[in-house]
């Protein structure tokens, strides 16, 4: 015969633990129900009655199954120079992120401590890894046959156009110049852009020093000053 399903509250078997979404109440010495995300424990369980849950009030939340007496307060409103990427709801805290073109270089419990500008790759270098909300752009030198003629945190290296007759060969920072009226194959005009950073929860990410025009944020690393990376044009 199948074992009888116990309904909360119930006394656990000696040596066993409570089931998923239940907790052991020390006072009642019973397994009791947790409250779902967006709720909190209004009345704790007894030997004869289960936990009574209630919804979180405005500007408060619980993200996990819980038995807390009060919901957590949402963080303060995002300042005018931050972007709210996640609103405060009963089930999640507000998340404020850095303005476009900046990323969180140092984080703290309540969000970001220091926003820093995303590195810009100078001509001859393209974006190898785009920036995110919590990590800087990584630049790389343009490989032979490719170029970037912009100072940008989003442009990648693009192939040189192929000419019937080359007037000026391309290099890492300049496209090839053709003598004929049109090249045999050319890329679509305009720079290639990588997508802007997607929102992620703030966390500390050590940036990788790379060629750039934006200041290197290697100041976050626990070491003394080092020479700028090759191709860097920062002050």
């Amino acid at each position: 015969l199948p074992a009888q399903v116990a309904f909360t509250p119930y006394a656990p078997e000696p040596g066993s633990t409570c089931r998923l979404r239940e907790y052991y109440d020390q006072t009642a010495q019973m397994c009791c129900s947790k409250c779902s995300p967006g709720q909190h424990a209004k009345v704790f369980c007894t030997k004869t009655s289960d936990t009574v849950c209630d919804s979180c009030e405005d500007s408060t939340y619980t993200q996990l199954w819980n038995w807390v007496p009060e919901c957590l307060s949402c963080g303060s409103r995002c300042s005018s120079d931050q972007v709210e990427t996640q609103a405060c709801t009963r089930e999640q805290n507000r998340i404020c992120t850095c303005r476009p073109g900046w990323y969180c270089a140092l984080s703290k419990q309540e969000g970001c401590r220091l926003c820093a500008p995303l590195r810009k790759c100078r001509p001859g270098f393209g974006v190898a890894r785009p920036g995110t909300e919590t990590s800087d752009v990584v630049c790389k030198p343009c490989a032979p046959g490719t170029f970037s003629n912009t100072t940008s945190s989003t442009d990648i290296c693009r192939p040189h156009q192929i000419c019937n007759v080359v007037a000026i060969p391309g290099n890492a920072s300049m496209d090839a110049v053709c003598t004929s009226t049109s090249p045999t194959r050319s890329m679509a005009p305009g720079a290639v852009h990588l997508p802007q950073p997607v929102s992620t929860r703030s966390q500390h990410t050590q940036p990788t020093p790379e060629p750039s025009t934006a200041p290197s944020t290697s100041f976050l690393l626990p070491m003394g000053p080092s020479p700028p990376a090759e191709g860097s044009t920062g002050d």
Partner: antibody
Framework: QVQLLQSGPELVKPGASVKLSCKAS????????INWVKQRPGQGLEWVGW????????KYNEKFKGKAILTVDTSSNTAYMNLHSLTSEDSAVYFC????????????WGTGTTVTVSS | DIVMTQSHKFMSTSVGDRVSITCKAS??????VAWYQQKPGQSPKLLIY???TRHTGVPDRFTGSGSGTDYTLTISSVQAEDLARYYC?????????FGQGTKVEIK
């Protein structure tokens, strides 16, 4: 309201050290970095460094490494700056300052402490 | 380090006049510029951030403008209480740096 109250003026001899204090009130002390800024008589402002009270993380302007040491006492909501091997160049008003957000402009300034180095 | 240059150490003006204080950064600072007012014997006070956003409680006669490397603080109608030194600051990269200050004097 948010306030940063700094210690009184200091007259010190060349080669000596001095410890300046900055007592915070009206906000959660451990949640915001405290910065220190130097102002020499008739001159501009120079950023010395920051300290994050929650974990003691510090960052110094290269120019002040070895000259200034920043510390905090979270039990008294006080930030400190130790200045070492003082010379006449260190005679200045020193301000502590706080920022609200993750961009580093300073919206709350301390009252300032005048340090005079003289024999 | 980014150098912030305030070309005028002093500016003499009359009550009611318009005055513009300039600040030039040694590199593009993406409007990460703040302006402070420091009256004699007092601590600096934040006026403007992000080049043009007025801080809470700052009178609307103070306006900031600029982008790239060139920034301006304008007082549209100078009042006697505006006698002070004004500093620009960049918060684009560490170390944070300030201009040398421009002292506004009332004729």
């Amino acid at each position: 309201q948010v306030q940063l109250l700094q210690s009184g003026p200091e007259l010190v001899k060349p080669g000596a050290s001095v410890k300046l204090s900055c007592k915070a009130s009206g906000y959660s002390f451990t949640s915001y970095d405290i910065n220190w800024v130097k102002q020499r008589p008739g001159q501009g402002l120079e950023w010395v460094g920051w300290i994050y009270p929650r974990d003691g993380d510090t960052k110094y302007n290269e120019k002040f490494k070895g000259k200034a040491i920043l510390t905090v006492d979270t039990s008294s909501n006080t930030a400190y700056m130790n200045l070492h091997s003082l010379t006449s160049e260190d005679s200045a008003v020193y301000f502590c300052a706080r920022l609200t957000g993750p961009y580093w402009y300073f919206d709350v300034w301390g009252t300032g402490t005048t340090v005079t180095v003289s024999s | 380090d980014i150098v912030m240059t305030q070309s005028h150490k002093f500016m003499s003006t009359s009550v009611g006049d318009r005055v513009s204080i300039t600040c030039k950064a040694s590199q593009d600072v993406d409007t990460a510029v703040a302006w402070y007012q420091q009256k004699p014997g007092q601590s600096p006070k934040l006026l403007i951030y992000w080049a043009s956003t007025r801080h809470t409680g700052v009178p609307d006669r103070f306006t900031g403008s600029g982008s790239g490397t060139d920034y301006t603080l304008t007082i549209s109608s100078v009042q006697a209480e505006d006698l002070a030194r004004y500093y620009c600051q960049q918060y684009y990269s560490v170390p944070w740096t300030f201009g040398q200050g421009t002292k506004v004097e009332i004729k």
